[in-house]
C-alpha cells in the first residue's frame, strides 16, 4: 500500500499490508504488484466488514496480469505435399483469457511461406496473406497451403498485434513439414536403342535408355520387359540369370547387359514405373551388326638383296576381310619399323619421313618399298622385321610381323655378285693396278663364323677363267 | 480370341518319352514367351521352364534339366515339351501359358 | 533362385468376410508378382499382374498391393465361389517360381 512520508517532502514508500480501507482503494492507494514472471494469473481473499451486521467472508479477488508481450505460441506441423492444413488452435494459441477476447488482436506476417501460402478459407487464392485477425483464426478460416513442388519443409513467421493496447508478441516461427506424395508421372527422355556385335553380349549404356521423375529416385524408376525378339537381359555378375526388369541405377552402373541371339534386328518392348505411375507401350531396339574379321594371307616374308630397294606385293602381304572391304580401306600401320633399312612410298619423295600407314591397295599398286641400308660391316645374311597392324572399322585390328631376309644367297638382278664387294678395276692401258680389298672383298662369306675363331680361315679365290688381255 | 489348346491325356510306361503340344492362336506367336508348369496332384504349382519364341532359346528350372526339352515350330505357331525316360514321379498335369495371362486347358500325364 | 512365402498355408472364412493372402520374396522382384486362382481339374486364372494391376473380367473384389520383396491379394467381401488355391508367380528372373499356395476355404 502506499503510504506517505511523515514530512511534506519525504516520498511515499511501498509497505505490505493485511487490511485496507474503501478509501484506500478509491484514493488509489491499494497496489498489486506481480512479482513472479510467467505467472499470469493471481488471486487473494478478503473478509469485508463495515461495523454494520456481519463481515463478508472469503470474497475471491481474481486478478490477470498482462504479460509485457502477447504470448503466442506456435505448433509446428506436417502438410501433404501440395495439401492444406488449417492454422486453428492448438496449432496457433494466445494464452490466457484476457488477449484473445480483444477486438483489435491481429496476426502480422513477418515472413511469408516459400513454397506455400497462407490463405483465407473463402477469399482469393492467388497469394499469401500480409495479415489477418485473431478472429479469423478462430473461425478456423485461415489455412496453410502447399504448393506442390519437391520440397521437404517449409516456414513461416508471425506477429500477433494488440493495437489498442500498443502490445505485441515477439516473432514466433513455424516449421512446417512436407509429407512427399508421388504425383509425377515417370518420364522416358531417351530411347535411342542399341547398336552392338552379332553373339556379343554389351551393356545398354544410360546413354541409349534414360527416364526422369521429378519426385523418385534413380533406384525407383523401373523398366519392365517382356521377351526379347533377339537376345536376353542379364545383369552384370549373373549372365545366366535372365530378368524382366532393372532400374534407372541400374543403367547407370552400367550393370544391364543384353546378350544378342537370333536376329540381326530385333529389342524389346518395356514399360516404365516409379512405383506409383506406369509409362507402357514403349520399344527399345536392338541391332547387331554381323563380325566383320580381318586376315592376313601371303608369305608375310620378304626377301631382299643386300643394299637394294624391293617392293612389297601381294605374295607377301595380302589383307581380306569377311565383308570383302575395299582394298583401299584396309589400313596398315607401321608400329615399329625396320632397324636395317626402311619403308618408303614409291610416289612419295623417298629422302622423307619414315612410312607410318599404307594401304593394301598400295601393296597390290607395288609402291611400298623396303630400301636395305648397307651396313659397314660385312654380313651374310641379315633378317629384319616390320612389326604392323591391320585396321578397317568395325572389325577388330589384327596385328601382323613381316619378317625381312637379307641375303647375298638369292639371286639379284640387281647386284650380280653375291660378294661383299666387287667393283671391278680400272686400269690404264698397258699399265698394271692393284687389286685391293676395296675393289674386291669376299670376307663377308666369313660373317656366319664367331669373330674370335675368324682369323683361322681365310678365303680363297680360285680362278676358273684367266683375263683375256692381261694377266693376274 | 486368345487360345492356347494343348494335346491330349497321355499313358506311358517308365523309360518312354513323351511329346506334349501347345498350339497357340489369337495373337502374334513370336511376341510373348511360352512357359510350361507342373501341376502334381496334393502338390503345388512348379515352373518347369520357357522358351523365347521369337530366337527358340529355351531355359529350365534346375528340377527339369536334362530330361525335358521345350522346343517350338514357328510356322505351326506350337511349342512342344518333350519328357525322356519317363518315370513314375513325371504323373502330373503339364500346362502351358504365354504372358501370364492365357492358359492351356492341361495335358494329363500318366506314368506307370 | 528366388524363393516365394505364401502365408497362411490355409484359410477358413465366412461369406462377407475380407481377407489378405500373403507372399514375400528372397530378394526384390520389382512389382514382377502375378496372383493366380486355381480350382480343381482347372487352369490357373490370373487375377492380378505386376503386383496391383487389375486384370479385366475379374471381379473389383480382388485387389493387389506391395512392392520390393512384400506383396499381399485382398479379397473384399468373400463369396463362396473364390473357395480354391491362390498361387504367386515371380517373373522377375530365371528360372521363374511360384509359391507355395493358399487354400482358401468358405465356412
Known amino acids: 500500500m502506499v503510504s506517505r512520508g511523515a514530512l511534506a517532502d519525504e516520498p511515499p514508500s511501498l509497505d505490505p499490508v493485511q487490511s485496507f480501507s474503501q478509501e484506500a482503494v478509491d484514493t488509489g492507494r491499494v497496489l498489486y504488484l506481480h512479482s513472479r514472471p510467467e505467472a499470469w494469473s493471481d488471486a487473494f481473499s478478503l473478509d469485508v466488514a463495515s461495523g454494520l451486521g456481519a463481515p463478508l467472508e472469503g470474497v475471491l479477488v481474481e486478478l490477470e496480469v498482462l504479460p509485457a508481450a502477447i504470448p503466442l505460441e506456435a505448433q509446428n506441423f506436417s502438410v501433404p505435399e501440395g495439401g492444406s492444413l488449417t492454422l486453428a488452435p492448438p496449432l496457433l494459441r494466445v494464452s490466457g483469457p484476457y488477449f484473445p477476447t480483444l477486438l483489435g488482436l491481429s496476426l502480422q506476417v513477418l515472413e511469408p511461406p516459400q513454397h506455400g501460402a497462407l490463405q483465407k478459407e473463402d477469399g482469393p487464392q492467388a497469394r499469401t496473406l500480409s495479415a489477418f485477425s485473431w478472429r479469423m483464426v478462430e473461425e478456423q478460416l485461415i489455412r496453410y497451403v502447399h504448393d506442390g513442388s519437391e520440397t521437404l519443409t517449409d516456414s513461416f513467421v508471425l506477429m500477433a498485434n494488440a493495437s489498442e493496447m500498443d502490445r505485441q508478441s515477439h516473432p514466433v516461427a513455424f516449421t512446417v513439414t512436407v509429407l512427399p506424395v508421388n504425383d509425377q508421372p515417370p518420364i522416358l527422355t531417351t530411347n535411342t536403342g542399341l547398336q552392338m556385335w552379332e553373339g556379343a553380349t554389351a551393356p545398354i549404356p544410360a546413354e541409349a535408355l534414360r527416364s526422369t521423375d521429378g519426385d523418385s529416385g534413380s533406384e525407383d524408376l523401373v523398366y519392365t520387359i517382356e521377351q526379347p525378339s533377339n537376345g536376353r537381359v542379364v545383369l552384370r555378375g549373373a549372365p545366366g540369370t535372365e530378368v524382366r526388369s532393372f532400374t534407372q541405377a541400374q543403367l547407370d552402373g552400367g550393370l544391364v547387359l543384353f546378350s544378342h541371339r537370333g536376329t540381326l534386328d530385333g529389342g524389346f518392348r518395356f514399360r516404365l514405373s516409379d512405383g506409383e505411375h506406369t509409362s507402357p507401350g514403349h520399344f527399345f531396339r536392338v541391332t547387331a551388326q554381323k563380325q566383320v574379321l580381318l586376315s592376313l594371307k601371303g608369305s608375310q616374308t620378304l626377301t631382299v638383296c643386300p643394299g637394294s630397294v624391293q617392293p612389297l606385293s601381294s605374295q607377301t602381304l595380302r589383307a581380306s576381310s569377311s565383308a570383302g572391304t575395299d582394298p583401299q580401306l584396309l589400313l596398315y600401320r607401321v608400329v615399329r619399323g625396320p632397324q636395317l633399312g626402311r619403308l618408303f612410298h614409291a610416289q612419295q619423295d623417298s629422302t622423307g619421313e619414315a612410312l607410318v600407314n599404307f594401304t593394301q591397295a598400295e601393296v597390290y599398286a607395288g609402291n611400298i618399298l623396303y630400301e636395305h641400308e648397307m651396313p659397314p660391316e660385312p654380313f651374310w645374311e641379315a633378317h629384319d622385321t616390320l612389326e604392323l597392324q591391320l585396321s578397317s572399322p568395325p572389325a577388330r585390328d589384327v596385328a601382323a610381323t613381316l619378317a625381312v631376309a637379307v641375303s647375298f644367297e638369292a639371286a639379284c638382278p640387281q647386284r650380280p655378285s653375291h660378294l661383299w664387294k666387287n667393283k671391278g678395276l680400272w686400269v690404264p692401258e698397258g699399265q698394271r693396278a692393284r687389286i685391293t680389298v676395296a675393289a674386291l672383298d669376299a670376307s663377308n662369306l666369313l660373317a656366319s663364323v664367331p669373330s674370335p675363331q675368324r682369323s683361322e680361315h681365310d678365303v680363297l679365290f680360285q680362278v676358273t677363267q684367266f683375263p683375256s688381255r692381261g694377266q693376274l | 480370341q486368345i487360345q492356347l489348346v494343348q494335346s491330349g491325356p497321355e499313358l506311358k510306361k517308365p523309360g518312354e518319352t513323351v511329346k506334349i503340344s501347345c498350339k497357340a492362336s489369337?495373337?502374334?506367336?513370336?511376341?510373348?514367351?511360352m512357359h510350361w508348369v507342373k501341376k502334381t496332384p496334393g502338390k503345388g504349382l512348379k515352373w518347369l521352364g520357357w522358351?523365347?519364341?521369337?530366337?527358340?532359346?529355351?531355359t529350365y528350372a534346375d528340377d527339369f534339366k536334362g530330361r525335358f526339352a521345350i522346343s517350338l515350330e514357328t510356322s505351326a505357331r506350337t511349342v512342344y515339351l518333350q519328357i525322356n525316360n519317363l518315370r513314375n514321379e513325371d504323373t502330373a498335369t503339364y500346362f502351358c501359358?504365354?504372358?501370364?495371362?492365357?492358359w492351356g486347358q492341361g495335358t494329363t500325364l500318366t506314368v506307370s | 533362385d528366388i524363393k516365394l512365402s505364401q502365408s497362411p498355408s490355409i484359410l477358413s472364412v465366412t461369406p462377407g468376410e475380407t481377407v489378405s493372402l500373403s507372399c514375400r520374396a528372397s530378394?526384390?522382384?520389382?512389382?514382377?508378382l502375378h496372383w493366380y486362382q486355381q480350382k480343381s481339374h482347372r487352369s490357373p486364372r490370373l487375377l492380378i499382374k505386376?503386383?496391383?494391376d487389375s486384370i479385366s473380367g475379374i471381379p473389383s473384389r480382388f485387389t493387389g498391393s506391395g512392392s520390393g520383396t512384400d506383396y499381399t491379394l485382398n479379397i473384399n467381401s468373400v463369396k463362396p465361389e473364390d473357395e480354391g488355391i491362390y498361387y504367386c508367380?515371380?517373373?522377375?528372373?530365371?528360372?521363374?517360381?511360384f509359391g507355395g499356395g493358399t487354400k482358401l476355404e468358405i465356412k
Open positions: 501359358f504365354s504372358y501370364y495371362d492365357y
Open positions: 508367380l515371380q517373373g522377375y528372373s530365371t528360372p521363374w517360381t
Open positions: 505386376y503386383g496391383s
Open positions: 489369337g495373337y502374334t506367336f513370336t511376341d510373348y514367351s
Open positions: 522358351i523365347n519364341t521369337a530366337t527358340g532359346e529355351p
Open positions: 530378394q526384390t522382384i520389382y512389382k514382377n
